[in-house]
Amino acid sequence: GSERTCCPVNWVEHERSCYWFSRSGKAWADADNYCRLEDAHLVVVTSWEEQKFVQHHIGPVNTWMGLHDQNGPWKWVDGTDYETGFKNWRPEQPDDWYGHGLGGGEDCAHFTDDGRWNDDVCQRPYRWVCETELDKASQEPPLL
């Protein structure tokens, strides 16, 4: 595939990545799938600056990111190491709360209204952010 050198239309460039901010809501798995179909992934927050950038663009709205613990430990969807990486949980979070009455705990992470993170039921229809890195090989075949 060819290398992507600029962001697609309606995506925002920041620090060699492209971001797309939804204005509707989906369950985490559907949001994850949406990003994959765009040759991207749910946003992976790796630094203070990236947190601030995303926080600014989403505003005070619950928004899915690419972090989950559906298989046990917390994992970023692109394989970024969770344990040694940037974290911005709200105090007392994540708590894997079972008291919501929807069955199970809370396995998917989202930005809260103040930008910090919370774990919640993955089926909730929150907005989401897709991210793709510039300079990575795209899946599209090169133009002849």
Epitope: W48, K52, P91
Partner: antibody
Framework: QVYLVESGGGVVQPGRSLRLSCAAS????????MHWVRQAPGKGLEWVAV????????YSADSVKGRFTISRDNSKNTLDLQMNSLRAEDTAVYYC????????????WGQGTLVTVSS | DIQMTQSPSSLSASVGDRVTIICRAS??????LNWYQQKPGKAPKLLIY???SLQSGVPSRFSGSGSGTDFTLTISSLQPEDFATYYC?????????FGGGTKVEIK
């Protein structure tokens, strides 16, 4: 009422170490990030370091990296700054300050403690 | 590191004057900009956060504006208690640098 009280300042020789503490009260200490900021005599403010409410993230200024370590004990409501290999240019009033949480502004400050590095 | 440059470094003004202080960042900090006031021998006090939000208890004569790299603190009608030094600070990227300060003196 939020109170932040720094202690541990004093006169120390270059190359030696000093440990500053900040005792917090009047708020849930374990829910807030904390900063150290310093001010050399007659000079402006210089940010030194921040630690997340749970210690999960720490950042410091280039001028103190590798020499100063920020830490906290949420069970004792205390913030510390371990200062090693002190230099004359570290002479300053050191303030601890509370981080508001999301925009990282410093909404409450202590009264400061003076550190003098001199032979 | 992001450099924060304040201007002027000092100014003389009279009670009732409108005062404007400028803070420029060496790169975009979006709107992650705070303003503090400091009086001699005292700890700094938060005035404005996130560019334009007034901290609780701060008089409405203080206001902030700007985005990206250029920011402004305005005191609409200077009062005797406003004579102090003012600092901007960015919180977009660590290290969380301050501006050099602007000393507001009595004319």
């Amino acid at each position: 009422q939020v109170y932040l009280v720094e202690s541990g300042g004093g006169v120390v020789q270059p190359g030696r170490s000093l440990r500053l503490s900040c005792a917090a009260s009047g708020f849930t200490f374990s829910s807030y990030g904390m900063h150290w900021v310093r001010q050399a005599p007659g000079k402006g403010l210089e940010w030194v370091a921040v630690i997340w409410y749970d210690g999960s993230n720490k950042y410091s200024a280039d001028s103190v990296k590798g020499r100063f370590t920020i830490s906290r004990d949420n069970s004792k409501n205390t913030l510390d700054l371990q200062m090693n290999s002190l230099r004359a240019e570290d002479t300053a009033v050191y303030y601890c300050a509370r981080d508001n949480g999301n925009w990282n502004y410093l909404d409450y400050w202590g009264q400061g403690t003076l550190v003098t590095v001199s032979s | 590191d992001i450099q924060m440059t304040q201007s002027p470094s000092s100014l003389s003004a009279s009670v009732g004057d409108r005062v404007t202080i400028i803070c420029r960042a060496s790169q975009s900090i979006i709107s992650y900009l705070n303003w503090y006031q400091q009086k001699p021998g005292k700890a700094p006090k938060l005035l404005i956060y996130a560019t334009s939000s007034l901290q609780s208890g701060v008089p409405s004569r203080f206001s902030g504006s700007g985005s990206g790299t250029d920011f402004t603190l305005t005191i609409s009608s200077l009062q005797p208690e406003d004579f102090a030094t003012y600092y901007c600070q960015q919180t977009y990227s660590p290290p969380l640098t301050f501006g050099g300060g602007t000393k507001v003196e009595i004319k």
